[in-house]
Amino acid sequence: KKEDGESTAPTPRPKVLRCKCHHHCPEDSVNNICSTDGYCFTMIEEDDSGLPVVTSGCLGLEGSDFQCRDTPIPHQRRSIECCTERNECNKDLHPTLPPLKNRDFVDGPIHHR
């Protein structure tokens, strides 16, 4: 979900934005801080064993509108929140995993012995 207003084409920020990064720190980050022309994000998703994993970092302006839209992906429990209102704003983002749907149990991969 986008935290500060929807727009079709993201307008370039006049200045760099610093974000907290965790599990998603690019090479040019320093002390778990990355910089971007786009958005800060925090994401929660299930790993292969069904445990929730929280990731945070920077999204470049290019394509970030789509990534921040949080379109549901079949068979994948994941939620992302984005922000731009201040540096390290993603420290205060707390996305939650979408609830399990009954279909998620039925439609899972079938393992044959």
């Epitope: 006049p14 200045k15 760099v16 610093r18 040019d28 971007t36 786009g38 470049g60 290019e62 540096n87």
Partner: antibody, heavy 116, light 112 residues
Framework: QVQLQQPGADLVKPGTSVKLSCKAS????????MQWVKQRPGQGLEWIGE????????MYNQKFKGKATLTVDTSSSTAYMQLSSLTSEDSAVYYC?????????WGQGTTLTVSS | DVVMTQTPLSLPVSLGDQASISCRSS???????????LHWYLQKAGQSPKLLIY???NRFSGVPDRFSGSGSGTDFTLKISRVEAEDLGVYFC?????????FGSGTKLEIK
């Protein structure tokens, strides 16, 4: 037009502190970072750090942590850099500079002389 | 810290000549966003630096088209096609990809 006004010079004693100022005009002060850069003769330019006036978020060059403290007064569109425990090594020209993704405008610089 | 190595340190030219300054960085300046934050400044005697070129090859407003920038990754060049008297001074390259931001040691453009 964008202007960054700095006092021309300051003379201070070793062991003391000094607060350098940089008054911005001609643009929205909170829309850009303000950086500070040190220049000593024959030693090139050194990045001290930067402050985002919109939320007072700072980033420092590790080398200047504990030496420099960056602040802003948004009501007067002025950025400040305090330098503490001054020695002759701190004698230099100090520039403030407007930064978005690169520095596009510089102040005229303040020549700081540390001498007893 | 990223080390910016500029060559030559001094560049004697005749007015009307072409001048070329090289800047090499100790690591790639391609940012995770895809941008390359390498910039060029000119500092004339007794003045503050002035921006010439930003993000490798973009001329800043009011900068004559005889100035051009090129390069990628770790290797960058500033060219002045026909040197004029007002171009004399010290040229610095600078990177704002990696914190702390760093500068080249400068190239002094002077009359032969």
């Amino acid at each position: 037009q964008v202007q960054l006004q700095q006092p021309g010079a300051d003379l201070v004693k070793p062991g003391t502190s000094v607060k350098l100022s940089c008054k911005a005009s001609g643009y929205t002060f909170t829309s850009y970072w303000m950086q500070w850069v040190k220049q000593r003769p024959g030693q090139g330019l050194e990045w001290i750090g930067e402050i985002d006036p919109s939320d007072t978020y700072t980033m420092y060059n590790q080398k200047f942590k504990g030496k420099a403290t960056l602040t802003v007064d948004t009501s007067s569109s002025t950025a400040y850099m305090q330098l503490s425990s001054l020695t002759s090594e701190d004698s230099a020209v100090y520039y403030c500079a407007r930064f978005g993704y690169y520095v596009d405008y510089w102040g005229q610089g303040t020549t700081l002389t540390v001498s007893s | 810290d990223v080390v910016m190595t500029q060559t030559p340190l001094s560049l004697p030219v005749s007015l009307g000549d072409q001048a070329s300054i090289s800047c090499r960085s100790s690591q790639s300046l391609v940012h995770s966003t895809g941008n390359t934050y390498l910039h060029w400044y000119l500092q004339k005697a007794g003045q503050s630096p002035k921006l010439l070129i930003y993000k490798v090859s973009n001329r800043f407003s009011g900068v004559p088209d005889r100035f051009s920038g090129s390069g990628s990754g770790t290797d960058f060049t500033l060219k002045i096609s026909r040197v004029e008297a007002e171009d004399l001074g010290v040229y610095f390259c600078s990177q704002s990809t990696h914190v702390p931001f760093t500068f080249g040691s400068g190239t002094k453009l002077e009359i032969k």
